[in-house]
């Protein structure tokens, strides 16, 4: 649905690419929702360009976005969250390109936080826990989480585990002994709502014991 439009204001009638993408975040600030849009071409001259959303709104017909450097942003309680809204790029009163979007299909969850790993002596495993603000939300409550971990020396060799809970157990025998690991997690809507992966949580770092040290705290110094 990304559109191209001829900019009649330019004498040479050059064809500019005004295609854009948006994501919504529901109940991102109390009961307020947000909608963020940006041009896919970073070289678009955005000086006189505005974004407007119309339809599927409560009490108002249209809303204008605020411009924040390269992005366009709305924070409001007025999204109906039923049906499609029309989002347009405008110069003055002229629409250059529009997209009809259901805001419930472009949801980007907030990043998980409080990621932590604890080594369980005796059980010889690592319990991964994290938190998500979505547990307290009314709308986007059900998420799929992607936990990614790697041995720190393996730059791009991430192992991914998908789960719906906020707890994961990693068996020590499945990990390399005496190794340093990095772990992080992100989330995506998983029930009714659709959309995009959240940002990654901050990473947490943990070490695996040497093979012969299955219990007892060993200071390696």
């Amino acid at each position: 649905e990304s559109g191209y439009a001829q900019n009649g204001d330019l004498e040479d009638a050059e064809l500019d690419d005004y295609s854009f993408s948006c994501y919504s975040q529901l109940e991102v600030n109390g009961s307020q929702h947000s909608l963020t849009c940006a041009f896919e071409d970073p070289d678009v001259n955005i000086t006189n360009l505005e974004f407007e959303i119309c339809g599927a709104l409560v009490e108002v017909k249209c809303l204008n976005f605020r411009k924040l450097q390269e992005i366009y942003f709305i924070e409001t309680k007025k999204f109906l969250l039923i049906g499609k809204s029309n989002i347009c790029v405008k110069v003055g009163e002229k629409s250059l390109t529009c997209k009809k979007i259901d805001l419930t299909t472009i949801v980007k969850p907030e990043a998980p936080f409080d990621l932590s790993v604890v080594y369980r002596e005796g059980a010889n495993d690592f319990v991964v826990t994290f938190n998500t603000s979505h547990l307290q939300k009314k709308y986007v409550k059900v998420l799929m989480h992607d936990v990614a971990y790697r041995q720190e020396k393996d730059e791009n060799k991430w192992t991914h585990v998908n789960l719906s809970s906020t707890k994961l157990t990693l068996l020590q025998r499945k990990l390399q002994p005496a190794a340093m690991y990095e772990i992080k997690v992100r989330s995506i809507p998983d029930h009714y709502f659709k959309g995009f992966w959240s940002e990654w949580s901050p990473s947490y770092y943990f070490r695996t014991p040497e093979i012969n040290n299955s219990s007892g705290e060993m200071d390696p110094i």
Partner: antibody, heavy 120, light 107 residues
Framework: EVQLQQSGPELVKPGASVKMSCKAS????????MHWVKQSHGKSLEWIGY????????GYNQKFKGKATLTVDKSSSTVYMELRSLTSEDSALYYC?????????????WGQGTTLTVSS | DIVMTQSHKFMSTLVGDRVSITCKAS??????VAWYQQKPGQSPKLLIY???YRYTGVPDRFTGSGSGTDFTFTISSVQAEDLAVYYC?????????FGGGTKLEIK
């Protein structure tokens, strides 16, 4: 011998900021998480947050987000905690504590504490 | 946040007696509980981690037990130098949380 040496007592006015330090010695500094814990007078212990010296990664108790900022100087094996917009509620004894080797989740060595008094 | 509750603020005991301090977690924390001793005017010291593992150099009169939500710290034969406040801490998830402390008094 592992040692965590904290900076001296601070007396500051309400609304001001303060930055206290914790200098580590006797172990490989960048290998261990460093945590900060608050102990109000005659009260229990409250975890503030951690910093991982190797890359400066940190995590905070949501209660202290915006109040505390943890930083690290690897060259001097020192971690810092800055507390801002101080009120009398921030008057307390603040400890740095080293997280354990594998996961950093509990605390095997503690500094001697820095006493913060907020008073006009 | 996980709340750690130490039901007794104070416990009084005689030298040589056995004493047990309890700690209850508001949710399952498996075996991820540590116990600390804080003597008057001193910093806390780690005694027990992972519910039942004695930290290096800690006398064997100190033991820990429990899993899930209920944990116990025991001194098998109390010595005069054990006068202190004892804290439990869950190391299961962030934020790390401590119990309110139990002050052990020697009669």
């Amino acid at each position: 011998e592992v040692q965590l040496q904290q900076s001296g007592p601070e007396l500051v006015k309400p609304g001001a900021s303060v930055k206290m330090s914790c200098k580590a010695s006797g172990y490989t500094f960048s290998d261990y998480y460093m945590h900060w814990v608050k102990q109000s007078h005659g009260k229990s212990l409250e975890w503030i947050g951690y910093i991982y010296p190797d890359n400066g990664g940190n995590g905070y108790n949501q209660k202290f987000k915006g109040k505390a900022t943890l930083t690290v100087d690897k060259s001097s094996s020192t971690v810092y905690m800055e507390l801002r917009s101080l009120t009398s509620e921030d008057s307390a004894l603040y400890y740095c504590a080293r997280g354990t080797y594998y996961d950093g989740s509990y605390f095997d060595y503690w500094g001697q504490g820095t006493t913060l008094t907020v008073s006009s | 946040d996980i709340v750690m509750t130490q039901s007794h603020k104070f416990m009084s005991t005689l030298v040589g007696d056995r004493v047990s301090i309890t700690c209850k977690a508001s949710q399952d924390v498996s075996t991820t509980v540590a116990w600390y001793q804080q003597k008057p005017g001193q910093s806390p010291k780690l005694l027990i981690y992972s519910a039942s593992y004695r930290y290096t150099g800690v006398p064997d009169r100190f033991t820990g037990s429990g899993s899930g939500t209920d944990f116990t710290f025991t001194i098998s034969s109390v010595q005069a130098e054990d006068l202190a406040v004892y804290y439990c801490q869950q190391h299961y998830s962030i934020p790390r949380t401590f119990g309110g402390g139990t002050k052990l008094e020697i009669k």
